[in-house]
Interface confidence: low
């Protein structure tokens, strides 16, 4: 999907309003110099791009994200405010119901969330400082 | 109105240096990197490097690092530039420019240096 | 570095005509690249950012496209206005970097 269309300035809100704080409730009791940030973004869409493929794509060792809180509002986020955005993520979907129904929060799921917190911070302050 | 305001041409000697400022009206200063660009006479644009106002981090390209210090004033909105040990390659028009995602869609009136003994 | 090679280096129009401008990038630089127009003794205006999105106040004969590495620009009918030197540019991350530059002359 090309991120170039969204209202950046609306999920941008929708971040900072509910977003954010769901990834700090996953995160709770995790330290925040635990993981480093091996994902980085150079602008908005670019970073929406990795938001997503780091959200809903299953990874070895952390298949369940999709179905966190934080993770649904992305997805509603994503489908209100980037044009056509719901009508690719049919496919996916479908992936996301195959998904195992348990909430299982693996060192590699909090990993990912850490990731995913450092790609939300650079979508706010977009840029890539170093490529 | 967003406004990026350049200080005037300057005539400089060789080994000399020069500090051009660019002063930003019309938006939230900080929420905006700025940006220089270099435009040898009859030649193309070149970018030089960047700085966030937030926090005052560059990023320069490599043939700048020992030519070119950035820094701005958040107090009055201004970015400043400037070119160390002046040769005549620096001759040059700068423009200073705002981007968020970069591209840059608001330019300064770029400012004149000129180098001569 | 990303290279962009812009062509041609210069050209010659008459008004009316339809006029294409094309950059190529050295590497996969997906949507993230800028048209400007600069006109002598002017500061450049932004054109067309994200390959194809008019920016404000742009004349919808500007356009943009994109196809794998290579860009794009179109002024579907050339005004008196639109001769000028236009420039690209990726911003896909550090270092940006700007084409070579088309001069678009009078013929």
């Known amino acids: 999907y090309d991120f170039t269309n969204c209202d950046f300035e609306k999920i941008k809100a929708a971040y900072l309003s509910t977003i954010s704080k769901d990834l700090i409730t996953y995160m709770s009791g995790t330290k925040s110099t635990e993981f480093n940030n091996t994902v980085s973004c150079s602008n908005r869409p670019h970073c929406l791009t990795e938001i997503q493929s780091l959200t809903f794509n299953p990874t070895a060792g952390c298949a369940s994200l999709a179905k966190e809180m934080f993770a649904m509002k992305t997805k509603a986020a994503l489908a209100i405010w980037c044009p056509g955005y719901s009508e690719t993520q049919i496919n996916a979907t479908q992936a996301m119901k195959k998904a195992r129904k348990s909430k299982v929060t693996t060192n590699k799921c909090l990993e990912q969330v850490s990731q995913l917190q450092g790609l939300w911070r650079r979508f706010n302050r977009p840029l890539l400082k170093q490529q | 109105e967003v406004q990026l305001v350049q200080s005037g041409a300057e005539v400089k000697k060789p080994g000399a240096s020069v500090k051009v400022s660019c002063k930003a009206s019309g938006y939230t200063f900080t929420t905006y990197w700025m940006h220089w660009v270099k435009q040898a006479p009859g030649q193309g644009l070149e970018w030089m490097g960047m700085i966030d106002p937030s926090d005052s981090e560059t990023t320069l390209i490599q043939k700048f690092k020992d030519k070119v210090t950035m820094t701005v004033d958040k107090s009055t909105s201004t970015a400043y530039m400037e070119l160390s040990s002046l040769r005549s390659e620096d001759t040059a028009v700068y423009y200073c420019a705002r981007t968020l995602d970069g591209y840059y869609d608001y330019w300064g009136q770029g400012t004149t240096v000129t180098v001569s003994s | 570095d990303i290279q962009m090679t812009q062509s041609p280096s210069s050209l010659s129009a008459s008004v009316g005509d339809r006029v294409t401008i094309t950059c190529r990038a050295s590497e996969n630089i997906y949507s993230y690249l800028a048209w400007y127009q600069q006109k002598p003794g002017k500061s450049p205006q932004l054109l067309v950012y994200f390959a194809k999105t008019l920016a404000e106040g742009v004349p919808s004969r500007f356009s943009g496209s994109v196809s794998g590495t290579q860009f794009t620009l179109t002024i579907s009918s050339l005004q008196p206005e639109d001769f000028a030197t236009y420039y690209c540019?990726?911003?896909?991350?550090?270092?940006?970097?700007f084409g070579g530059g088309t001069k678009v002359e009078i013929k």
């Open positions: 540019q990726h911003h896909y991350g550090t270092p940006w970097t």
